[in-house]
């Protein structure tokens, strides 16, 4: 039950995260005009990954796409690439995780396959989240660098008579959306990887075998215990991993192919 809950929650959290990454990538407000030195501007500038916008005194907003590839800064291209990779990986991860969900039965899919798929989607979500966080952080760093550079030569005077305030840009809403979304995707991925550990294939339900010990008779029925019993709560029980029986302590000591968190 705990595995299903962990897996389901991981899926939902990742879904929200990826939706956020998509939203952040599409948003125009990656950088917004810093109003500290010009709070009375009637023309407000903001920029996204794909276009730059100007809101004028009429309330009208005019946006113009970056209709060039070669003319754009390499950093912007890198951020675009990171965000797109994040979205693609996240989308594939979502697709894989849907089929991996324990609560969904698809034909005669074995639990080992579901475990593998859960781990795969988890890793995809982690990489997707990292891509988004990296992309947003690279852009933020670019903004900070440009901000201080433009502060250094804030005023460009014409013979000292007329002052032209250079437009500075600060963090836009998209950056915060991206950071949060990336974090959620990352958390969702970790949850999927954790869920994978409890998704070990349950042993075939064999008939009970009697083992006769000297002095008294003990009937022992092997069967993989479910992860819902919790870690450490049933350390005497045997759990079948890759065909070999190991105690719960052993399972934690020697990682199997499903133990990558």
């Amino acid at each position: 039950m705990a595995v299903t809950a962990c897996q389901g929650l991981g899926f939902v959290v990742s879904l929200i995260g990826i939706a956020g990454i998509i939203a952040a990538t599409c948003m125009d407000q990656w950088s917004t005009q810093d109003l500290y030195n010009n709070p009375v501007t009637a023309v407000f500038n903001y920029q996204g990954l794909w276009r730059s916008c100007v809101r004028e005194s009429s309330g009208f907003t005019e946006c113009r796409g970056y209709f060039t590839l070669l003319g754009l800064p390499a950093m912007l291209q890198a951020v675009r690439a990171l965000m797109i990779v994040g979205i693609v990986l996240g989308a594939i991860g979502l697709l894989v995780s849907i089929f991996a969900l324990k609560c969904i039965r698809i034909g005669s899919m074995e639990d080992s396959a579901k475990a593998n798929m859960t781990l795969t989607s988890g890793i995809m979500f982690i990489v997707s989240g990292l891509c988004a966080i990296a992309g947003v952080s690279v852009f933020a760093n670019m903004l900070v660098t440009n901000f201080w550079m433009s502060t250094a030569n804030m005023y460009t005077g014409m013979g000292g008579m007329v002052q032209t305030v250079q437009t500075r840009y600060t963090f836009g809403a998209a950056l915060f959306v991206g950071w949060v979304a990336g974090g959620l995707t990352l958390i969702g991925g970790v949850m999927m990887c954790i869920a994978c550990r409890g998704l070990a294939p349950e042993e075939t339900n064999y008939k009970a075998v009697s083992y006769h010990a000297s002095g008294h008779s003990v009937a022992y029925k092997p069967g993989g215990f479910k992860a819902s019993t919790g870690f450490g709560s049933n350390t005497k029980n045997k759990k079948i991993y890759d065909g070999g029986a190991r105690t719960e302590d052993e399972v934690q000591s020697y990682p199997s192919k499903h133990d990558y968190v």
Partner: antibody, heavy 115, light 113 residues
Framework: EIQLQQSGPELMKPGASVKISCKAS????????MHWVKQSHGKSLEWIGY????????NYNQKFKGKATLTADKSSSTAYMHLSSLTSEDSAVYYC????????WGAGTTVTVSS | DIVMTQSPSSLTVTAGEKVTMSCKSS????????????LTWYQQKPGQPPKLLIY???TRESGVPDRFTGSGSGTDFTLTISSVQAEDLAVYYC?????????FGAGTKLELK
């Protein structure tokens, strides 16, 4: 066609207050700010401020703060300017203007303050 | 506040003549975001509201005759009427559309000789 229809002329006593209306048609009322401009007789134009029908935001020229209050009724696509404590200095033609670069203006409302 | 200074205050011309009027702002009206100058020109005839002629310092509003030309950048702007017609007799205002409060010049009155 975008149009701004302003209310008729007003003759007011000093100390009184007046509310001028500006009814918009031909466009989505919430898409553009509604600006108000004052023109005293034979003088230049003075920007009073704007009202944003989308979120109710306002921005006033410091000179007109306390004198003018801008509001709007979205349901009727009408913007209003309330002028308080009228003096002879407030005698002027008041225009509402909207769209990009004040492309559309109302015909103007003449306010005369006289005892 | 940005101060808009127009000169001359009045111009007496004959029909067909070329006319140039100036507008200077106390601060640059150039927006680095889109490299546009937020300077607007209006024409006002007696008893009428102002009419938009030119925005972004040099872009003619649709329907405005091509004899009207706007030029300039930063702080110095010019409105030129290549061949004045009788219907052009009016007051011309320049406006700062870049910074609040939005400010207008005192106007240049175009009169017929």
């Amino acid at each position: 066609e975008i149009q701004l229809q302003q209310s008729g002329p007003e003759l007011m006593k000093p100390g009184a207050s007046v509310k001028i209306s500006c009814k918009a048609s031909g466009y989505s009322f919430t898409s553009y700010y509604m600006h108000w401009v004052k023109q005293s007789h034979g003088k230049s134009l003075e920007w009073i401020g704007y009202f944003d029908p989308y979120n109710g935001g306002t921005n006033y020229n410091q000179k007109f703060k306390g004198k003018a209050t801008l509001t709007a009724d979205k349901s009727s696509s009408t913007a209003y300017m309330h002028l308080s404590s009228l003096t002879s200095e407030d005698s002027a033609v008041y225009y509402c203007a909207c769209y990009r670069f004040f492309a559309v203006w109302g015909a103007g409302t003449t306010v005369t303050v006289s005892s | 506040d940005i101060v808009m200074t127009q000169s001359p205050s009045s111009l007496t011309v004959t029909a067909g003549e070329k006319v140039t009027m100036s507008c200077k702002s106390s601060q640059s009206l150039l927006n680095s975001g889109n490299q546009k100058n937020y300077l607007t020109w209006y024409q006002q005839k007696p008893g009428q509201p102002p009419k938009l002629l030119i925005y972004w310092a040099s872009t003619r509003e649709s329907g405005v005759p091509d004899r009207f030309t706007g030029s300039g950048s930063g702080t110095d702007f010019t409105l030129t009427i290549s061949s004045v017609q009788a219907e052009d007799l009016a007051v011309y205002y320049c406006q700062n559309d870049y910074s609040y409060p939005l400010t207008f010049g005192a106007g240049t009155k175009l009169e017929l000789k």
